[in-house]
């Protein structure tokens, strides 16, 4: 770090005038990674006069640049060419006499402060006046310039003849063109000073060439590619004062292609995943064993992601049986042609022949797209009937087997209910329990981020054998009823699950911790909870919606939480159901959520803190945190739980750097920018999701492994948001195209390799959760932790 400056992982700060800096600060090789620097603050540096072309280029992540009360006289035209993330520039009280708009034209600045510079009145600075007028906000700057007679005049009053904005005019034919054809665009520009003209074609794939004079130009695009559909082409006129552009959107029509069609995968429902390209929107038609498949609410097409002319989705089958096994053909058709692909699907064996997998029900209600032979995106209502066209050729034997299955299932179900009732009576008499303690009915689906998978003998990571989805945890997500709930095996829903009931008078609220969609969370004291302590601090989650469904969800969640017991899962103490609101009681974790904790113990927080500053997390402490989260995830996987929202915001920190998985359902409110809203209700943590979860809503233990990799990245960046520099749509594009997060500066190579092992595109290629935990444990052991971080 240069003398007179100090450097952290993300900031450079130079304010000491002695000795001061004479050149823009540069970092030593092998010190801080310049790509991670987001802020540079320079003050009192009177001998800093120039920013050269290559001074700032290494700081590609730079967002805030402040140079104040210094000697800055000249900024090279291409100084900020590589700094596309720059948002705030403050050059207050320097020695700038002129500043070209060329420095900034490619930047999306939200702030450019130029107060207190001795600008010379000329056409060169007219763009600043134009910019100020365009902003027209109440906090416009008082800018002045010196005229020929060395008089300071307000920039707002500056009048210079032959110095105005240019204009661009694009003469374009109808820009809807068929793939493979060619097109020519013409453009004319005008203005004083005479503008330059250029074409902005973005990332156009098709071959193109332009002929440009000063005021006229043409662009010829040949053999147009379907990849260019939806792209914008602009003709830009630019002079000293500013620029004008005229744009057209290119629409390319082409025949559909089915680029991806795979065997069914199971998660919370069965899904035959596909990707189709085509423009205009192709109509999709499914065939089952050669006959048209009429879609219904049980078998329907869902489009999850649309990228211009590319559609990722599923043929979703709710509760398919052996009768749905067979060949599925997808035909995509528009006026330019059609494509078809076929796959064989096996959902379940014949009754009594093989065990097959349990069917699934989705936990989130997605928008429904497309009936039979409709365009993608058509949301017309469908018949609720199960289609008959696909079963007409079945034999009577199959119908008999269906009746047999129904009868047997009914008898078994009835027996189970009787057994539960008897068990309940037996418990009451055996333990002589008083009060309302009982087995809470489990008659509806829960509403939270941890998901229970019961699939018989399947491994926790198995995605093939239709797992049963029962959601538990602490976050409210819209759900639809799961008729398979009673199919949970003894190993998952313990028959002796008794949710502890806590008397309301034993709970004394102290203060509010936050609020989620479901209700408020409070810090409270709970009396008579533990025999060894008179009272303990707890976190209390209240339920504001007292509807029947919400109450059922509440009871379901309580029962499932009672079964989750591990040192790295937040402890659930019980419920209070006397009157309203309904209350859930959890252990209180003193230091709050892990994301907040990481940020508070990062270099920036340490640098900026006043008074009693926090200490920066060491590498060994980071490893200690990581291995605890991995331990919690090993446990969840062993219990056949898929979390679906693993992130540092959903982990909590207690005394002595103890970390546990669990949140109080406030993440979607407190960390709303971490979620991407799909439709009305669903909020997806896309920055933590693997490609198959984004494209096909497929959540498995392997998708949790991917998220764990992102959590490791969060830990080693002190709580940065993954892909913080990208918008949600850009993130979706990046992840689905196979890009991964870069190695954090503080991250050892072995840990980054572990992250890369979590981010393998193919789920089955990802590291095993137990292996991840073992590796992190070994790394943490090799690097002992000193727990003074918490003071």
């Amino acid at each position: 770090c240069p003398t007179s400056c100090k450097c952290s992982a993300s900031r450079i700060w130079c304010s000491d005038p002695s000795p001061g800096i004479v050149a823009f600060p540069r970092l030593e090789p092998n010190s801080v990674d310049p790509e991670n620097i987001t802020e540079i603050f320079i003050a009192n540096q009177k001998r800093l006069e120039i920013i050269n072309e290559d001074d700032v280029e290494a700081y590609v992540g730079l967002r805030n640049l402040t140079i104040v009360d210094s000697g800055l006289k000249f900024v090279a035209h291409k100084a900020f060419l590589k700094n596309s993330n720059l948002q705030h520039i403050n050059f207050t009280r320097n020695k700038l006499t002129s500043l070209s708009r060329k420095h900034f034209r490619h930047l999306d600045l939200s702030e450019l402060i130029l107060v207190g510079n001795p600008f010379t009145c000329s056409c060169d600075i007219m763009w600043i006046k134009t910019l100020q007028e365009a902003k027209s906000s109440p906090d416009t700057q008082d800018l002045y310039c010196l005229n020929e007679s060395s008089k300071n005049i307000p920039l707002a009053n500056l009048q210079i003849p032959n110095c105005g904005l240019p204009s661009a005019n694009l003469a374009a034919p109808n820009l809807t063109v068929e793939e493979g054809k060619s097109i020519t665009l013409s453009c004319s520009v005008a203005g004083d000073p005479v503008p330059n003209m250029y074409w902005d074609v973005g990332n156009l794939v098709s071959k193109h060439m332009n002929e440009t004079s000063h005021t006229q130009g043409s662009l010829r695009i040949t053999n147009i590619s379907s990849d260019d559909s939806g792209k914008q082409i602009s003709c830009v006129a630019e002079n000293l004062v500013g620029e004008d552009q005229d744009s057209v959107n290119l629409t390319v029509h082409f025949a559909p292609t089915i680029t991806f069609l795979e065997s069914p995968t199971s998660d919370h429902h069965w899904c035959i995943p596909f990707t189709v390209k085509g423009n205009p929107k192709p109509a999709l038609q499914w065939f089952y064993n050669g006959a048209i498949l009429n879609e219904s609410k049980y078998i329907c097409t869902k489009i999850h992601v649309t990228n211009h002319t590319e559609y990722h989705g599923c043929l979703q089958l709710d509760n398919p049986t052996h009768m749905n096994n067979g060949d599925y053909t997808l035909i995509a058709k528009n006026e330019y042609g059609k494509d078809e692909k076929q796959i064989s699907a096996h959902f379940m064996g014949w009754p009594g022949i093989d065990d097959g997998a349990n069917p699934n029900y989705p936990d989130v209600i997605y928008e429904d797209y497309g009936t039979a032979a409709n365009d993608i995106g058509d949301t017309t209502n469908r018949s609720n009937e199960i289609p008959s066209t696909d079963v007409t050729d079945k034999t009577g034997r199959e119908h008999l087997s269906v009746y047999a299955v129904v009868v047997i299932a009914s008898v078994v179900g009835f027996c189970l209910l009787v057994m539960l009732f008897l068990l309940k009576l037996a418990r009451h008499s055996k333990f002589g329990m008083k009060g309302p303690a009982s087995v809470i009915s489990n008659d509806d689906d829960s509403a939270s981020p941890l998901h229970h998978i019961s699939n018989g003998s399947n491994t926790p990571s198995s995605s093939e054998g239709g797992p049963d989805a029962v959601i538990i945890g602490m976050t409210k997500i819209p759900v639809i009823e799961n008729p398979q709930y009673f199919g949970i095996t003894n190993s998952q829903l313990k028959p002796d699950t008794f949710v502890q009931h806590i008397k309301r008078h034993n709970i004394v609220l102290k203060r509010e911790l936050g609020e989620g969609a479901f209700g408020k969370v409070f810090l409270a004291e709970c009396y008579n909870l533990c025999p060894e302590q008179d009272k303990i601090l707890v976190a209390v989650k209240t339920l504001k919606d007292a509807s029947d469904n919400a109450r059922k969800d509440f009871h379901r969640e309580a029962e499932l939480l009672t079964n989750l017991q591990h040192e790295h899962i937040v402890k659930f103490y019980g419920v209070c159901v006397e009157g309203d609101p309904l209350i859930m009681v959890f252990e209180y974790m003193k230091h709050g959520d892990l994301n907040k904790f990481l940020r508070a113990h990062g270099p920036d927080a340490v640098l900026m803190a006043e008074g009693n500053p926090p200490t920066e997390l060491t590498q060994s402490q980071m490893l200690h945190i990581a291995q605890q989260i991995a331990a919690g995830m090993v446990y969840l996987a062993s219990q056949h739980f898929v979390h679906r929202d693993l992130a540092t915001r959903n982990c909590l920190v207690g005394e002595n750097l103890l970390v546990k998985i669990g949140d109080f359902g406030m993440s979607r409110d407190v960390y709303s920018t971490d979620y991407y809203r799909v439709g009305g209700h669903t909020m997806l943590p896309i920055r933590w999701m693997p490609p198959e979860s984004i494209m096909y809503r497929k959540f498995t233990t392997e998708s949790d492994v991917w998220s764990l990799g992102v959590v490791l990245w969060e830990i080693f960046t002190y709580g940065k948001q993954p892909w913080y520099q990208l918008s949600n749509n850009e993130v979706i594009e990046c992840i689905t195209q196979g890009r991964v997060l870069q190695r954090p500066r503080t991250c050892p190579q072995e840990v980054y390799e572990l992250m890369l092992g979590c981010w393998q595109r193919e789920p089955h290629m990802r590291k095993n959760i137990k292996g991840i935990h073992t590796l992190l444990q070994n790394l943490a052991k090799a690097s002992p932790v000193y727990l003074d971080i918490l003071g």
Partner: antibody
Framework: QVQLVQSGAEVKKPGESLKISCKGS????????IGWVRQMPGKGLEWMGI????????RYSPSFQGQVTISADKSISTAYLQWSSLKASDTAMYYC?????????WGQGTMVTVSS | LPVLTQPPSASGTPGQRVTISCSGS????????VSWYQQLPGSAPKLLIY???QRPSGVPDRFSGSKSGTSASLAISGLQSEDEADYYC???????????FGTGTQLTVL
């Protein structure tokens, strides 16, 4: 050689004004900050403020803001420290110093005595 | 006003090694470079150490400086009688946008 020469000792009455000087030589006077430091009898050093003679930009310590004025005349390579109304508590030795890598060059000091 | 804290006095016999500490906060010593000054009786201060541990030409190598976190220290080895003086540390303070001096340490050579 590089040096800073300060004006001579002053004896003043409370309420009077005073301007003491510090002349630089042997280096580019406009390119370095000049600071002023107070040392009251038997006490430690106290930083008062700095000026950049190139553009007369100043920084004051909060304790001295509004109590003194620091100025410079670059044409004669001289920095000044002035009071509009002296108090008995202003009695002290005042040093000017050039700021480069630390305060590397010091004036010999000006003793200011304020008494009625 | 935040000042840097030094012990009021220190002493040693000729040839001995003495250390003078200087304690500050994150906004001064913790985030910026420290310089040390020697003031012989009746003289103007003189720069002894700059940028935490650098010696200007002419300063004997018996004088050395170091910094760790929000504290700095000046070490004098092979103490000599002419080292008897007041010693001050100083650093830029970001929150004040100005310099701060230490309280000063009077070194006595016994």
């Amino acid at each position: 050689q590089v040096q800073l020469v300060q004006s001579g000792a002053e004896v003043k009455k409370p309420g009077e004004s005073l301007k003491i000087s510090c002349k630089g030589s042997g280096y580019s006077f406009t390119s370095y900050w000049i600071g002023w430091v107070r040392q009251m009898p038997g006490k430690g050093l106290e930083w008062m403020g700095i000026i950049y003679p190139g553009d007369s930009d100043t920084r004051y310590s909060p304790s001295f803001q509004g109590q003194v004025t620091i100025s410079a005349d670059k044409s004669i390579s001289t920095a000044y420290l002035q009071w509009s109304s002296l108090k008995a508590s202003d009695t002290a030795m005042y040093y000017c110093a050039r700021h480069d890598y630390g305060m590397d060059v010091w004036g010999q000091g000006t003793m200011v005595t304020v008494s009625s | 006003l935040p000042v840097l804290t030094q012990p009021p006095s220190a002493s040693g016999t000729p040839g001995q090694r003495v250390t003078i500490s200087c304690s500050g906060s994150r906004s001064n010593v913790g985030g910026n470079t420290v310089s040390w000054y020697q003031q012989l009786p009746g003289s103007a201060p003189k720069l002894l150490i700059y940028t935490n541990n650098q010696r200007p030409s002419g300063v004997p190598d018996r004088f050395s400086g170091s910094k760790s976190g929000t504290s700095a220290s000046l070490a004098i080895s092979g103490l000599q009688s002419e080292d008897e003086a007041d010693y001050y540390c100083a650093a830029w303070d970001d929150s004040l946008n100005g310099y701060v001096f230490g309280t000063g340490t009077q070194l006595t050579v016994l």
